[in-house]
């Protein structure tokens, strides 16, 4: 997996009015690290492990940033022509990438009213529209109103995703999101009988990274997709992650039935307490 | 704990321009939020006057903004209101208060009476 | 601008009693509201952000509702330290606003 940095940005009008402020969120290597306050009117850590590593330089610098993107995102949201009445949003979702070879990628894309109409390369200024006649016409309004902007030239781009992949590798080199393993805790819980079955739930936590294998086995052999409910993979807030598998079995038959995990290489089966 | 106290002449004639003080005491203004002019006239009426942010942007009430100026002096911790070519109908008790959108902290007020 | 109206000025209400004072904006605001209470001679005192978050050290008996246009600051069991004018204010978009203001007695 690619180390990544991605800013998420949102803002609303209601009736023709582009509210003051914006929302945004940033997250490293997919775990949130920074939300924009707006009462403080700042970007502040997200996460003890994102405010213990970074320093105070790092949310000045975010805060000037995201203020100067809000601020883009909400002239832009002023310019979209479609506007009806009620609530409307506009979304930017930035990202850029350091692979294993270290080959980058940048790109941005956005959404109006939760919908995606136009995404961006910055490294090559390509830009790709949805097929749908809405987001088309979405994606040339906001165009031409970048066209009309001086700033918005090449450069600009190219410095975006520069910029992006400055603060990624910074944060890196803090240690933030260094390439480390956190086994899973892994914890198996039985809930009340119901009609002779009881369900069991195997739940792992605090692990990273993100991927991770979860399922429930009977006399050694994986239970079928359908037979098995599985958690989404979250994360905890302490740059790690948490999920669970639960499933159905009859009353008495727990000692058939266990828990296999396999996180970065390494495996365990847990059994169904008596 | 966060502390405003605004300070003022109390009494200025017409035309005039009227300066206030915000004098903030257990928080720098310049770590964040926004530092915020609040007037309430005779009548109770509230009225948001605009602030300098923790930054030194500055945003203005439009109904103000040819006559408002808000700046400040970050090495005292103090930001200041003026106001220019005042008339009778700006009478009203000045409140700073701190906030980006809601206000949490606030002066205790200043009353200011316009009158020749 | 977004006008806040506080269609009553005044209310009248029992001790213990239970009271609503209502906002409604121009514009939909989108729970970007606040409330405030304000005692003779003092500053106006934050009671609650976004529509309905209490703010810290202020009493449970207050509450706020509402969406959209309208809004509602409750009050339950009052009490005598609760006589006072409330204001609604927003911070939807600039120039924030505030009602004209309700002034709670005791009856």
């Known amino acids: 997996e690619p180390h990544s940095l991605r800013y998420n940005l949102m803002v609303l009008s209601q009736d023709g009015s582009v509210q003051s402020g914006f929302l945004a969120e940033g997250h490293l290597d997919g775990q949130p690290f920074l939300r924009y306050d707006r009462q403080k009117r700042r970007a502040k850590p997200q996460g003890q492990w994102a405010e213990n590593v970074l320093g105070a330089k790092t949310w000045d610098t975010e805060t000037e940033d995201l203020t100067e993107n809000g601020q883009d995102l909400r002239r832009t949201l002023t310019h979209i022509k479609d506007q009806k009445g009620g609530l409307h949003s506009l979304q930017e979702i930035r990202v850029c990438e350091i692979h294993e070879d270290s080959s980058t990628r940048g790109s941005r894309h956005f959404y109006y009213d939760g919908e995606l109409f136009l995404s961006q390369n910055l490294e090559t200024q390509e830009s790709t529209v949805p097929q749908s006649s809405r987001a088309q016409t979405l994606a040339m309004n906001v165009t031409n109103f970048w066209k009309e902007d001086a700033m918005k030239t090449k450069t600009h781009y190219r410095a975006m995703q520069a910029d992006c992949l400055q603060k990624l590798q910074r944060y890196l080199k803090s240690g933030v999101a260094i390439r480390r393993t956190v086994p899973p805790m892994v914890n198996v819980t039985c809930s009340e009988v119901s009609e002779g079955n009881i369900t069991v739930t195997c739940r792992a936590s605090s692990f990273y990274p993100r991927n991770i294998t979860l399922t429930w086995r009977q006399d050694g052999v994986s239970l079928s997709h359908n037979t098995q409910q599985w958690g989404d993979v979250l994360p905890d807030g302490n740059g790690t992650y948490q999920t669970w598998v639960a499933t159905r079995i009859r009353q008495g038959e727990e000692q058939r039935f266990t828990c296999y995990m396999e996180h970065s290489g390494n495996h365990g089966t847990h059994p169904v307490p008596s | 704990e966060v502390q405003l106290e605004e300070s003022g002449p109390g009494l200025v004639k017409p035309s005039q321009s009227l300066s206030l003080t915000c004098t903030v005491t257990?928080?720098?203004?310049?770590?964040?939020?926004?530092w915020n002019w609040i007037r309430q006239f005779p009548g109770n009426k509230l009225e948001w006057m605009g602030y300098?942010?923790?930054?030194?942007?500055?945003n203005y009430n439009p109904s103000l903004k040819s006559r408002i100026s808000i700046t400040r002096d970050t090495s005292k911790n103090q930001f200041f209101l003026q106001l220019n070519s005042v008339i009778t109908e700006d009478t009203a008790t000045y409140y700073c208060a701190r906030g980006g959108t809601y206000f949490d902290y606030w002066g205790q007020g200043t009353t200011l009476t316009v009158s020749s | 601008d977004i006008v806040l109206t506080q269609t009553t000025s005044y209310l009248s209400v029992s001790l213990g009693g239970r009271v609503t004072i209502a906002c409604k904006a121009s514009?939909?605001?989108?729970?970007?509201l606040a409330w405030y209470q304000q005692k003779p001679g003092n500053a106006p005192r934050l009671l609650i952000s976004d529509a309905t978050s209490l703010e810290t050290g202020v009493p449970s008996r207050f509450s706020g509702s509402g969406s959209g246009k309208d809004y509602t600051l409750s009050i339950t069991s009052l009490q005598t330290e609760d006589v006072a004018t409330y204001y609604c204010q927003h911070y939807w978009s600039t120039p924030w606003t505030f009602g004209g203001g309700t002034k709670l007695e005791i009856k």
């Open positions: 514009a939909h605001i989108n729970n970007w």
């Open positions: 257990g928080y720098s203004i310049t770590s964040d939020y926004a």
């Open positions: 300098i942010s923790y930054s030194g942007s500055t």
